[in-house]
Interface confidence: medium
């Protein structure tokens, strides 16, 4: 799943609020022990930024070797640098681990731009700022890579949190989270709060700053406001969901809702942008351009190739529209919407010499592999990956960037008919979204 770009037919019939309150599961329903409440030891355990990925500290081997690992819900391999590389400060040294076991099998993962390859094995793994457990997990020891590691990103490996179906070399390689749940009493659920800074961070600031939280095995109430709304996981491969309607500043894009999910829609922490299928991207950009027409921006900006800058503190957030994605709800004919601000989809960029300016990249881009709800979306919300109940929850993040006039929102219920028809039935292929 990629960091710059991815470091990868019918109408929803309405979807507009009709004032009809449909029944839904309350946010306060009793659940398994340990699923809710406070997870103090895990709060603030992520660092990084949307453009280069968010990472968590992990240890591998005996004695433990500490590595920073990119949290990626768009892939399913646990893979770590295991050989010297110009962009790595450290790497996994298998020969120093008394608990390493070689699986005598290689793995090769090509992407649209770049690749990694390595050797499969297992070792003991733990997460210092996570649950107090150690598991034996599959590890791909990366011995060769091209355009995979990012200079200055400060992570040395990737934790693929999606399902076995997209694991490489095949679905027999058990992903880390499956191993964790099988070998411990950790509930089959994790949640992510990715915190965009709202301004560019230099290298030392990233190292010193908090990037968010990965709560393993539960939900922490302090990380969100309002209610959690859940959308079904359509199929357990990527974290696939169904979008039933899209609005720009409240204006329906009025597309056949199948287009929004062509050929799938996924939630992917390893992708920077909100990526949209070609037709949807073109319609969305047209609408965003029209809404922000008080200023004329270069075409290269809308293509993500050029930046726009304003004098520090004068970014006219108000001229840019909010974007709402309506997601299928858990109840028949019920949907809810998540709304992001320009503070999420205009990404601050740090490589500009004129430091008295605030410069941004348009972080919505075109995709040929469906909708990817990357960091741009996730930075607005606390996202619960409830694998046990095959659903993903969204609530407004306590750390999202906003202004005094508008805030990100999660709202519902809305009546939306025939939502099942919004899903696209994809031909079976083996693919990964990493770095496409």
């Amino acid at each position: 799943t990629q960091h710059g770009i991815r470091l990868p037919l019918r109408s929803g019939l309405g979807g507009a609020p009709l004032g009809l309150r449909l029944p839904r599961e309350t946010d306060e329903e009793p659940e398994e022990p340990g699923r809710r409440g406070s997870f103090v030891e895990m709060v603030d355990n992520l660092r990084g930024k949307s453009g280069q990925g968010y990472y968590v500290e992990m240890t591998v081997g005996s004695p433990p070797q500490t590595l920073n690992i990119l949290v990626d819900t768009g892939s399913s391999n646990f893979a770590v640098g295991a050989a010297p590389h110009p962009f790595l400060h450290r790497y996994y040294q298998r020969q120093l681990s008394s608990t390493y076991r070689d699986l005598r099998k290689g793995v090769y993962v090509p992407y649209t731009q770049g690749k990694w390859e390595g050797e499969l094995g297992t070792d003991l793994v733990s997460i210092p700022h996570g649950p107090n457990v150690t598991v034996r997990a599959n590890i791909a020891a990366i011995t060769e890579s091209d355009k995979f590691f990012i200079n200055g990103s400060n992570w040395e490996g990737i934790l693929g949190l999606a399902y076995a179906e997209i694991a490489r070399p095949d679905d027999s390689l058990e992903p880390f989270f499956d191993s964790l749940v099988k070998q411990t009493h950790v509930p089959n659920l994790f949640s992510l709060q990715l915190c965009g800074a709202g301004f560019p961070l230099n290298q030392s600031e990233v190292l010193a700053s908090v990037g968010g939280s990965m709560i393993i095995g539960g939900i922490d109430h302090s990380l969100y406001t309002g209610s959690l709304w859940y959308t079904p996981i359509r199929r357990e491969w990527y974290y696939e969901v169904i979008i039933v309607r899209v609005e720009i500043n409240g204006q329906d894009l009025k597309m056949d809702c199948k287009e929004y999910n062509y050929d799938k829609s996924i939630v992917d922490s390893g992708t920077t942008n909100l990526r949209l299928p070609k037709k949807v991207f073109e319609a969305a950009v047209k609408s965003i351009k029209a809404a922000s027409s008080t200023e004329k921006f270069p075409d290269g900006f809308w293509l993500g190739e050029q930046l726009v800058c304003w004098q520090a503190g004068t970014t006219p957030w108000n001229i840019f529209p909010v974007i709402s994605l309506y997601l299928m709800g858990e109840v028949t004919n019920q949907s809810f919407r998540i709304t992001i601000l320009p503070q999420q989809y205009l990404r601050p960029v740090e490589d500009v010499a004129t430091s008295q300016d605030d410069c941004y990249k348009f972080a919505i881009s075109q995709s040929s592999t469906g909708t990817v709800m990357g960091a741009v979306i996730m930075e607005g919300f606390y996202v619960v990956f409830d694998r046990a109940r095959k659903r993903i929850g969204f609530a407004v993040s306590a750390c999202h960037v906003h202004d005094e006039f508008r805030t990100a929102a999660v709202e519902g219920p809305f009546v939306t008919l025939d939502m099942e028809d919004c899903g696209y039935n994809i031909p079976q292929t083996d693919e990964s979204t990493l770095m496409t």
Epitope: E295, F297, P298, D299, G300, F301, E305, Q306, L307, V308, C309, W310, Q311, T314, P316, V349, D351, V352, A353, T354, D357, C359, K361
Partner: nanobody
Framework: DVQLQESGGGSVQAGGSLRLSCAVS????????MGWFRQAPGKEREGVAA????????YYADSVKGRFTFSQDDAKNTMYLQMNSLKPEDTAIYFC????????????????????WGQGTQVTVSS
């Protein structure tokens, strides 16, 4: 790290020609503006020529119109300033610069448009 390196300066007789080059490297995003500026001894830096990328519009200062031509080679990440019919008043240090879109900058030669500048190359025109 962004670097701009000018070359091609030198001394020439009035009426002569020079071609300045500027190699741009390390720029993460396509620049919106690319420009040539000059600074004569004891004077303010002034814009000579500028191009808006994507739109392709080229702007020239009145004093050089018809004599100077701005061109670029995207494949080589290089911009050029062809200077013909040079005059003694063209004597100056010439700088290339690149920058991003800025809503507040008023003209193509507003130096606030430009993020990165070369070190400059001396052009001397004698009569």
């Amino acid at each position: 790290d962004v670097q701009l390196q000018e070359s091609g300066g030198g001394s020439v007789q009035a009426g002569g020609s020079l071609r300045l080059s500027c190699a741009v490297s390390g720029f993460s995003y396509s620049p919106y503006y690319m420009g040539w500026f000059r600074q004569a001894p004891g004077k303010e830096r002034e814009g000579v020529a500028a191009i808006r990328k994507g739109i392709g519009t080229t702007y020239y200062a009145d004093s050089v119109k018809g004599r100077f031509t701005f061109s670029q080679d995207d494949a080589k990440n290089t911009m050029y300033l062809q200077m013909n019919s040079l005059k003694p008043e063209d004597t100056a240090i010439y700088f290339c610069a690149v920058g991003h879109y800025r809503a507040y900058a008023t003209t193509s030669f507003d130096p606030r448009r430009y993020d990165y500048w070369g070190q400059g190359t001396q052009v001397t025109v004698s009569s």
